[in-house]
């Protein structure tokens, strides 16, 4: 088969991807070091011509139809370091005639994913691989791992077994892998991890199984190295016992069935009966433990999509390094962090989509908190300085609650209102859909917000001076869907405002922007505007990029400024083809089709054109 095909060759690298090849080409340079034959139709791998390429270091045979490996096919490739046979048909009996892959003395990475391999077969396929560092067996049909599965792989560090059907891992299955640091067992059928004992492991992915319990081996002097543990999308009923994992930095427990206990534990030894719900909150560490404080190094904890109704004080106590805590989509009715120094490093707290009615944040707790997500709860009467106490808070989302903002210091407002003035760190605030009836004067005084969303508060009354103090900072303002008929906001004073959303109100007039400002996007959809006079809009011409106007009863005449934008202006007006206007006769036409003479007919001069 001395047949040249249009491969790409660079130095000693050759790519023959997706060329419909039925055989390994024999006319490639003999000193080729990298050969990519992926995406072809190879069915068998023979020692000849593959053996001609003795300099090969990288060989990619993925996504072919390989079902036959000639014994010794790779024997001559003494420099081979990376071999991919992913997505082939190695499970067919002919692949294993004698000795499977054979010895791979220098191969450091081997990809056998997507081959429908089953357990007994794998042991026959894998030969001696003393240098193997990375092995992928993902997307196969493995049901169990025995102590014979991974033999002769003393250097293996990374093992990927995701998307198999593993139900059983025999004791000692990984014993022959003393250097294993990364293990991916996600998307299998595991139900229990009862004796986790891989001390050298750093990263363990157990997501998307059916695990009901996770228990480390009770070895008092054990020095577990695990830093990253993913248990999301399992069936855990309790917070797992992680006291033996002092180095844990990342822990994902989302999408389980976890409930935290409501009362104190019955004893204080650290390991508790699952029936008590304490299977074990990380309360105390085994005596020989390096750190003595379980989870004290944890940076990221995700408990979203569980069934947690309450967070016990003791649970948060040891999380002294935690930066990111996600408790969204649980059943929390209350959340408290009152103690001095509680969660001192926490930067993001997501409590969204719970059933929170009360929130108690101590004056000096959560000192590093920058982002607080509370959307989709039932918060109503909060202590007035709930958020003002958070010294580092930058972003606060309260969408879908029932929070009523207080006024400024001179006009405090009714009981149960929450102060949003004087929060000097706060930059972004969402009060969407909070049934706010009145926004009082000075509500955001000395709070230099750049983004404020007050949308979906139908009937909202914005008092004069309600946005006072934001003139020099506000960049994004949304007041969509509030039924506003007049705007008690002197918009031209907001010199930094870039995006303004006034859609779905009943506005018919805008203040005059006579001098240049920063506004880039103006959304006026579904209001009552008939005219946008040039006298009011002129100051926007230098900055405005997008103007949304659909759903307004625009007049065909007198809208010269708008017509000019449609024809040659810099402003991109949405849906220009469909922007409908009305003549006094109620005749509707596309605004872009209106000519000056159409307005002169009835003595209606188009004053701006």
């Amino acid at each position: 088969h001395q047949d040249k095909v249009p491969c790409k060759m660079v130095d000693k690298k050759v790519s023959c991807q997706v060329l419909g090849l039925l055989q390994v080409p024999s006319v490639l340079p003999p000193d080729t070091e990298t050969l990519d034959l992926s995406g072809n139709q190879l069915r068998s791998i023979l020692a000849s011509p593959l053996g001609f390429y003795t300099a090969l270091r990288h060989l990619d045979l993925s996504t072919n139809e390989i079902s036959f490996l000639q014994p010794g096919a790779f024997q001559a490739l003494t420099h081979l370091e990376h071999l991919s046979l992913a997505h082939n048909r190695l499970a067919m009996a002919t692949a294993l005639s004698a000795g499977g892959l054979g010895p791979l003395p220098r191969v450091t990475s081997l990809d056998l994913s997507g081959n429908s391999l089953y357990s007994g077969l794998l042991e026959r396929l894998l030969g001696e691989a003393p240098s193997l560092h990375t092995l992928s067996l993902a997307e196969n049909s493995l049901t169990r791992l025995t102590r014979h599965t991974f033999r002769d792989m003393p250097a293996l560090e990374q093992l990927d077994l995701h998307s198999n059907v593993l139900m059983d891992i025999e004791d000692g299955a990984f014993e022959g892998l003393p250097r294993l640091t990364h293990l991916n067992l996600s998307r299998n059928s595991l139900t229990c991890i009862s004796d986790f004992s891989l001390q050298q492991l750093r990263v363990l992915d157990l997501s998307c199984n059916s695990i009901e319990a996770f228990q480390t081996a009770s070895q008092p002097q054990a020095e577990f190295q695990l830093t990253w543990l993913d248990l999301r999308e399992n069936k855990l009923l309790h917070f797992p016992d992680l006291a033996a994992l002092p180095r844990l930095i990342y822990l994902n427990l989302s999408n389980n069935l976890i409930r935290l206990p409501t009362g104190p534990p019955q004893d204080s030894k650290g390991i508790h009966a699952p029936s008590e719900g304490w299977s074990a909150l990380p309360l105390s560490a085994p005596s020989g433990n390096a750190s003595g404080r379980p989870l004290s190094q944890l940076l990221n904890l995700d408990l979203s999509y569980n069934e947690i109704e309450l967070i016990p004080d003791s649970f948060l106590e040891h999380l002294t390094s935690l930066c990111f805590l996600n408790l969204s989509r649980n059943c929390l009715r209350t959340f408290e962090a009152r103690r001095l120094g509680s969660l001192p490093c926490l930067m993001l707290l997501d409590l969204s989509h719970n059933a929170l009615e009360t929130l108690e944040l101590g004056a000096r707790a959560l000192g590093s908190l920058r982002t607080l997500l509370l959307q989709g709860n039932a918060l109503r009467d909060l202590p007035p300085y709930t958020f003002a106490n958070l010294a580092s808070l930058q972003r606060l989302n309260l969408q879908g609650n029932r929070v009523s903002p207080c006024g400024g210091p001179d006009e405090p407002g009714p009981s149960g209102c929450v102060a949003f003035s004087g929060i000097t760190s706060l930059r972004s605030l969402s009060l969407v859909d909070n049934e706010i009836e009145l926004l009082r004067a000075g509500a955001f005084l000395h709070t230099p917000l750049t983004e404020l969303d007050l949308s979906s508060n139908p009937g909202l009354e914005v008092a004069t001076g309600a946005l006072g103090g934001l003139e020099a900072s506000l960049e994004v303002l949304a007041l969509q869907g509030n039924g506003l008929m007049v705007l008690q906001v002197d918009l031209p004073c907001f010199i930094c405002l870039k995006r303004l959303n006034l859609a779905e109100n009943r506005l018919s007039h805008l203040p005059a922007w006579t001098q240049a400002v920063s506004l880039e996007v103006l959304d006026l959809r579904n209001n009552s505007f008939s005219l946008l006079p040039g006298s009011a809009m002129g100051g926007l011409e230098t900055s405005l990029r997008r103007l949304y106007l659909q759903g307004n009863p625009l007049s065909c005449c007198g809208n010269g400024w708008l017509a000019a934008q449609l024809h040659q202006g810099r402003v991109d007006v949405d849906a220009t083809q469909d922007l409908i206007c009305r003549f006094s006769s109620q005749e509707e036409v596309s605004l872009s089709h209106v000519r000056p003479e159409d307005c002169e007919k009835g003595g209606l001069k188009n004053i701006n054109l």
Epitope: Q2, D3, K4, V10, K13
Partner: antibody, heavy 120, light 111 residues
Framework: EVKLVESGGGSVKPGGSLKLSCAAS????????MSWVRQTPEKRLEWVAT????????YYPDSVKGRLTISRDNAKNTLYLQMSSLRSEDTAMYYC?????????????WGQGTSVTVSS | DIVLTQSPASLAVSLGQRATISCRAS??????????MHWYQQIPGQPPKVLIY???NLESGIPARFSGSGSRTDFTLTINPVEAGDVATYYC?????????FGGGTKLEIK
Amino acid sequence: EVKLVESGGGSVKPGGSLKLSCAASGFTFSNYVMSWVRQTPEKRLEWVATISSGGSYTYYPDSVKGRLTISRDNAKNTLYLQMSSLRSEDTAMYYCARGYDNGDYVMDYWGQGTSVTVSS
Amino acid sequence: DIVLTQSPASLAVSLGQRATISCRASESVDTYGNSFMHWYQQIPGQPPKVLIYRASNLESGIPARFSGSGSRTDFTLTINPVEAGDVATYYCQQTNEHPPTFGGGTKLEIK
């Protein structure tokens, strides 16, 4: 001196057939990947087909697959393009071209072309 | 398919001046650190001829006045200085991904 000479062009009605030939000389024909490229009346270049040096493998863009067939006779140093079910958009100047020695789709020598017109 | 967009569609340059033609790919044409972008010249009445292969390599027999540069998606053919015999249409071609595609061409004229 490398020489490629196309022949077989002409006028044909839509749905008709035509067979183009390309006689090669001045190089070891059987060592090279060969291609056909066409140039539309608007002067756009379009790759039409490629064949491996031994003739075992052929490659086409989706727009001509099933209608155009490339083949070669290494004994006669000749490349062919059988064209059937022709359409008006197949009207073009058809060039025979030699691929680079390493087998890439880059074409280092081209013939003078043969014109094909498909019109009713 | 990878789309190649050449600009300008035509340009007029004075003799002895520099001509620059651009070719932009809809996605990267790099493999193994090399760019599989090539440039052809088609003098009126003649077939195309390779000038530059793999972005910057001069085909043998082509004068050094022609040079190519670029990587990933943005490529340039430069002719400096332009001579009368350079009046032609110039095409870029990518062979990184099947099917190989050509740009729409740039017509060079003398001012």
